[in-house]
């Protein structure tokens, strides 16, 4: 409980806080766990402990391991530890997860992003933001004090955020970066009773004997994304898998299409060289999803050949 | 009566991974798909993956994508989501559901959860 991971780049400054927290005027001593050696408080060192920070500037490789924090107070001493890992600078541009701080999630509403750990920092603007490596451009995207506003969210805003900014530790400057994922989430989705746009209630459907015929189920279901949604086809009141027909098979369409903003899914039956006895059958096209289920029921019908009259 | 048992919870570190599996136990109507919800603490319950149960369409949330996987054994009337690369903030009771039928009423049925802990 009063263990924090801390992570950083080599080379970057890093500042840990004490997970034991205290008054401003307590005495907070911390130690190298491995070695019970303690960190100085000299600022000529390039680690050192300021109250209940301990610092890294900047940062190396053969800094990662556990610290002890002990907060002493007249009364009592509480003891933490920071569990502090420091990764060598990736050469390419993706960000490996452990490398990443919490996944935030933004609306067409509500778009900020906070720059991770920035409060421990004594840094000035401007901030630099970075999409998948990218530097931000554009109107949409404003970097404000500690965190970016993106105007107008879009699904395509998605991605990994990178903060990048400049520790100032008397008067000798060092850099920070720091990632995190933005999922966007539609805050107008919704979800309603399926409604089925073909085929129509009771249709009748011309095929050809000895042909192939297709018969599309689709329907809609809501705005954004629905779960736990469904479309099939069923014979005679039986799901197609256990009919036993191997002529007559279902497939699926894509993933949700979505058609004037809602999400829609379709099945398609292909019935293989149509025999008669398929004209028999009722066909039904099952729309359902928690609001309940739709059914629109189909016939086939033999299309009659045309007359060649001289 | 139908029953749903999640099962394969359990704590893991940042970064490990875990499978969940879903039973679907009794007379089963017709299953037509199946998906995965969670819930943290104090948080609202949130959709994680969904399947047909053709198995042909799959839905993942965006905070998932990539790193989760959503399965189905139809012989086995068992779903499976196999979690990689798992963060701290997957941490949550996972929930299992099953979205069936017969004749024209729909079933909703719900389990009890599986608790997954992504700490350190």
């Known amino acids: 409980k009063f263990s924090k991971q801390s992570w950083g780049l080599e080379n970057e400054a890093l500042i840990v806080r004490c997970p034991r927290q205290g008054k401003p005027s307590y005495t907070v001593d911390w130690y190298y766990s491995q070695t019970n050696k303690s960190i100085p408080t000299q600022e000529r060192n390039r680690v050192f402990a300021s109250g209940q920070l301990l610092k890294f500037l900047p940062a190396a490789v053969a800094d990662s391991g556990i610290y002890t924090c002990i907060v002493r107070s007249p009364t009592f001493n509480r003891t933490g530890y920071a569990n502090v890992t420091i990764y060598k600078k990736q050469s390419d541009c993706n960000v490996p997860d452990y490398l990443m701080y919490s996944t935030v999630s933004g609306s067409e509403k509500n778009s900020k992003i906070y720059c991770p750990t920035i409060d421990l920092y004594n840094w000035t603007a401007p901030l630099e933001w970075f999409k998948n490596c990218q530097a931000l451009q554009g109107s949409r995207y404003r970097a404000h004090k500690s965190f970016l506003v993106i105007d107008n969210v879009m699904t395509e805003d998605a991605g990994d955020y990178t903060c990048k900014f400049i520790h100032n530790e008397n008067g000798a400057n060092y850099s920070v970066t720091a990632t995190r994922s933005f999922t966007v989430k539609d805050e107008q989705g919704f979800s309603l009773f399926p409604v089925i746009g073909a085929p129509a209630q009771n249709e009748i459907k011309e095929v050809e004997i000895g042909k192939n015929a297709n018969l599309t189920c689709s329907a809609c279901f809501g705005k954004g994304t629905q779960f736990l949604a469904a479309v099939l086809w069923q014979l005679n009141g039986t799901k197609i898998t256990d009919f036993g027909e191997p002529r007559i098979q279902q497939e699926e369409g894509q993933n949700q299409s979505f058609s004037n903003g809602l999400a829609c899914l379709d099945m398609v039956l292909r019935i293989a060289d149509v025999k008669e006895e398929d004209l028999l059958l009722q066909y039904d096209c099952l729309a359902l999803n928690l609001h309940g289920l739709r059914r629109h029921t189909v016939r086939l019908s033999r299309k009659n050949p045309i007359d060649h009259h001289s | 009566e139908v029953q749903l048992v999640e099962s394969g919870g359990g704590l893991v570190q940042p970064g490990g991974s875990l499978r969940l599996s879903c039973a679907a136990s009794?007379?089963?109507?017709?299953?037509?798909?199946m998906g995965w919800f969670r819930q943290a603490p104090g948080k609202e319950r949130e959709e994680v993956a969904a399947?047909?149960?053709?198995?042909?369409?799959?839905y993942y949330a965006d905070s998932v994508k990539g790193r989760f996987t959503i399965s189905a054994d139809n012989s086995k009337n068992t779903a499976y989501l196999q979690m990689n690369s798992l963060k701290p903030e997957d941490t949550a009771v996972y929930y299992c559901?099953?979205?069936?039928?017969?004749?024209?009423?729909?079933?909703?049925?719900w389990g009890q959860g599986t608790l997954v802990t992504v700490s350190s």
């Open positions: 559901a099953r979205l069936a039928f017969q004749g024209n009423t729909v079933f909703d049925l």
């Open positions: 009794g007379r089963t109507h017709s299953t037509a798909s």
């Open positions: 399947i047909s149960w053709s198995g042909g369409r799959t």
